[in-house]
């Protein structure tokens, strides 16, 4: 019995086709992905093939102005557009908080949305119950398949879960639903969740009774042959692990933004067993047209967003110092803005004994691409931060060692003068260089500041330990030749998108004055 | 649970026709083939033909001209008929799911007068 | 028609011996293959599937290997239970089987 399995993970906002690198649409013969254009392929293999499951592996929430304005309604609905068969939770869909997930998402999707990982308690327990589910058997064709899924356990630390849910370890919890299921005579079981590939993995290889497992999160690109496009493979699809009681398991995720569906092919035997597993990711490039309904039905949502763009968010009282000749040279209030917004976004306070769980952030001073002027009545607009963060990236929360801020820090002036992008701008750290001397060697003082504390206060960067930071994706990724940051980070969680980030502290703080203040000397 | 049971005579004359029913349970016909394979006692296994989940079947070239199965979906049976026995037809039958994952018993058939 | 090749027809060994057994396909089968165990009176039992993959509740001392046309068996500490008819099963095609290899009691 052969089963169709085409799944899509991190779209995070993606509606609308997007360029090659998942940014605003530009030239629209050379754009790909958007819902229109996935409806018409999902549609295309559910008439040619027989037993086809579309399924998401969470975080469609956040990540571009659709989100901001709809704030998940419009998942809910162009999910149900194209008839998906199931979700897992990811991280990003408690970003406004359970309420944010509960009225717009849960009460309105048309198909199950799971994780077996998350328990409700106290008085959410009973407003929550039923909405998610931790697993669902769905019949396809004559048969049934049981999805399981799971979320990613360091949710708390990068989202707005509140209080009433606990997150717990994926494994553990999986394994009683999964043996449940084979209770119930379900023998083919999908694990579909939101942890990143090296928990993927973990649960093929631990959890009993799991044939497949659909993930997410980490924007991991398998593919099998040739790649398509510029993601570089980081395994063949299926990536297969062996069990541990000796079953080949395939694992599979398509990188994200929509712009790829995955596409694998399952052959069970009569006892639920995986007798062969092949497929890859089909890239949604322009060679397969928009469906012309869900086209249609995004041009009417779109409207709302134009109007949105250009509505005041707050307003500012002094000069937004954007520009190239300050940002890349020396310490400016745009970038401590930005910063600021950063760690704002990133307030969690899980731990007593911390004051919150990051207080670091870094920011490209060439990723700082407009100033935003106080003398039109302070009016700071969408459409204003969009001039200045225009390249639709992510402030992501990432774990390093001191040893690497210092490398990046050593970075950031080692050809000062030039006008360069890797002038770092800061939160949370003081840093002061001596430029008289060779690069590589100009990093005097770097302090920062701390987190288990009452009081937060700056102390010496320590090279062995490990420092939570905030920083934008382009850097995560190693971006302007911040290389040390991409081979030497020990954790990497995506965010939430830089506009939003801003607009939203902007809309908190109502007017804002930011100064530059001796961050860096 | 899944399990394949095989009934039918025990013992048929030559030039008779067998006939075999295979009883499935704990998986569908229209999801799964099931196949059909026997051994003449000391002997090794021979495979004699397939029934798929659509309801088309393919036999062993050495069969073709005698051998029928045919299934009804709805009862969880698979018919093997065999006609013109021969004392060298005396073997266990074998019924088994399409990917071998699961066998009945078997039934040993002798062929005499 | 594939035609598998398997041997040894028999072997002798003792209780905590390792054995190997092998199947030779006459073309690349491409992992479409079976293991399956036989003993006198009792059902047929597949021990592994697709060339490597262990059914459910069979020990961790089989093990199966191989690609194209190579495949082999293995039981890294033989036990008493293990005495038995081993035969490879092809279903790349209409089904065929390895002539069998009987592990006996040295």
């Known amino acids: 019995w052969e089963l169709t399995i085409l799944h899509t993970n991190d779209v995070h906002s993606r509606l609308e086709q997007t360029s090659e690198d998942s940014s605003k649409c530009v030239n629209a013969s050379r754009c790909m992905g958007g819902v229109a254009r996935l409806f018409t392929k999902v549609q295309q293999i559910r008439r040619a093939e027989p037993n086809v499951l579309l399924l998401d592996a969470g975080d469609q929430y956040q990540g571009t102005i659709w989100f901001t304005v709809y704030k998940g309604a419009e998942v809910a609905h162009f999910m149900n557009a194209l008839r998906y068969d199931a979700m897992a939770l990811g991280n990003h869909e408690f970003d406004n908080g359970v309420e944010g997930l509960i009225e717009p998402l849960l009460k309105e999707a048309k198909f199950p949305i799971l994780s077996a990982n998350i328990k409700a308690k106290g008085p959410l327990a009973s407003q929550i119950s039923g909405l998610y589910l931790p697993y669902k058997v769905l019949p396809v064709g004559d048969e049934v398949v049981g999805i399981v899924g799971y979320t990613s356990k360091e949710t708390p630390f990068l989202s707005n879960p509140g209080t009433n849910l606990v997150f717990e370890d994926e494994i553990t919890a999986l394994q009683p639903e999964v043996d449940k299921l084979k209770t119930l005579n379900v023998n083919k079981i999908i694990a579909l969740g939101h942890s990143g590939f090296e928990m993927d993995k973990l649960i093929a290889q631990k959890v009993r009774g799991v044939d497949v497992v659909v993930g997410g999160h980490s924007n991991t690109f398998l593919y099998t042959g040739n790649p398509p496009s510029k993601e570089v493979p980081a395994g063949k699809y299926p990536f297969i692990v062996t069990s541990d009681d000796g079953r080949k398991v395939p694992v599979v995720q398509a990188y994200a933004f929509g712009k790829y569906l995955g596409y694998l092919k399952i052959e069970f035997d009569e006892r639920g067993n995986v007798i062969s597993s092949h497929g890859n990711p089909i890239l949604l490039n322009s060679s397969i047209p928009e469906d012309p309904s869900i086209k249609a039905d995004i041009n009417k949502w779109r409207i709302k967003l134009d109007n949105y763009s250009t509505q005041e968010l707050g307003k500012t009282i002094v000069y937004l110092d954007g520009s190239s000749q300050s940002c890349r040279f020396r310490e400016c209030n745009m970038g401590n803005l930005i910063c600021d917004a950063m760690i704002n976004n990133n307030l969690r306070h899980t731990d007593e004994m911390f004051w919150n769980h990051v207080s670091m952030c870094i920011l490209n001073g060439g990723g700082i691409r407009s100033p935003i002027d106080e003398r039109n009545n302070g009016t700071i607009t969408w459409e204003n931060l969009a001039a200045v963060l225009p390249f639709g990236g992510t402030f992501d929360l990432v774990q390093l060692k001191g040893s690497t801020l210092k490398k990046a820090f050593e970075h950031s002036v080692h050809r000062y003068g030039q006008s360069t992008g890797e002038f770092l701008q800061v939160g949370g750290i003081h840093v002061v260089y001596d430029l008289s001397r060779k690069p590589g060697d100009r990093v005097v003082k770097l302090d920062v500041l701390c987190t288990k504390c009452r009081v937060p206060s700056y102390d010496p960067l320590k090279m062995d330990e490990v420092y939570k930071v905030i920083l934008p994706n382009f850097l995560a990724n190693g971006g302007d030749g911040f290389q040390m940051i991409k081979d030497e980070l020990l954790r990497h969680d995506s965010g939430d998108q830089d506009i939003n980030v801003v607009s939203t502290y902007i809309s908190k703080m109502k007017v804002i004055y930011p100064a530059v203040e001796g961050r860096i000397k | 649970e899944v399990t394949l049971k095989e009934s039918g005579p025990v013992l048929v004359k030559p030039t008779e026709t067998l006939t075999l029913t295979c009883t499935v349970s704990g998986f569908s016909l229209s999801s799964y083939g099931i196949q059909w394979v026997r051994q003449p006692p000391g002997k090794l296994l021979e495979w004699l033909g397939v029934?798929?989940?659509?309801?088309?079947?393919d036999y062993n070239a050495a069969f073709i001209s005698r051998l029928t199965i045919s299934k009804d979906t709805s009862k969880s049976q698979v018919v093997l008929t065999m006609t013109n026995m021969d004392p060298v037809d005396t073997a266990t039958y074998y019924c088994?799911?399409?990917?071998?994952?699961?066998w009945g018993q078997g039934t040993l058939v002798t062929v005499s007068s | 028609d594939i035609q598998m090749t398997q041997s040894p027809s028999s072997l002798s060994a003792s209780v905590g011996d390792r054995v190997t057994i092998t199947c030779r396909a006459s073309q690349d089968i491409g992992d479409r293959l079976n293991w399956l165990q036989q003993k006198p009176g009792k059902a047929i039992k597949r021990l592994i599937y697709a060339t490597s993959s262990l059914d459910s509740g069979v020990p961790s001392r089989f093990s199966g290997s191989g690609s194209g046309t190579e495949y082999t068996l293995t039981i890294s500490s033989l036990q008493p239970e293990d005495f038995a008819t081993y035969y490879c099963?092809?279903?790349?095609?209409?089904?065929?089987f390895g002539g069998g290899t009987k592990v006996e009691i040295k």
């Open positions: 088994a799911g399409q990917y071998g994952s699961v």
């Open positions: 029934i798929w989940s659509g309801g088309s079947a």
């Open positions: 099963l092809q279903y790349a095609g209409s089904w065929t």
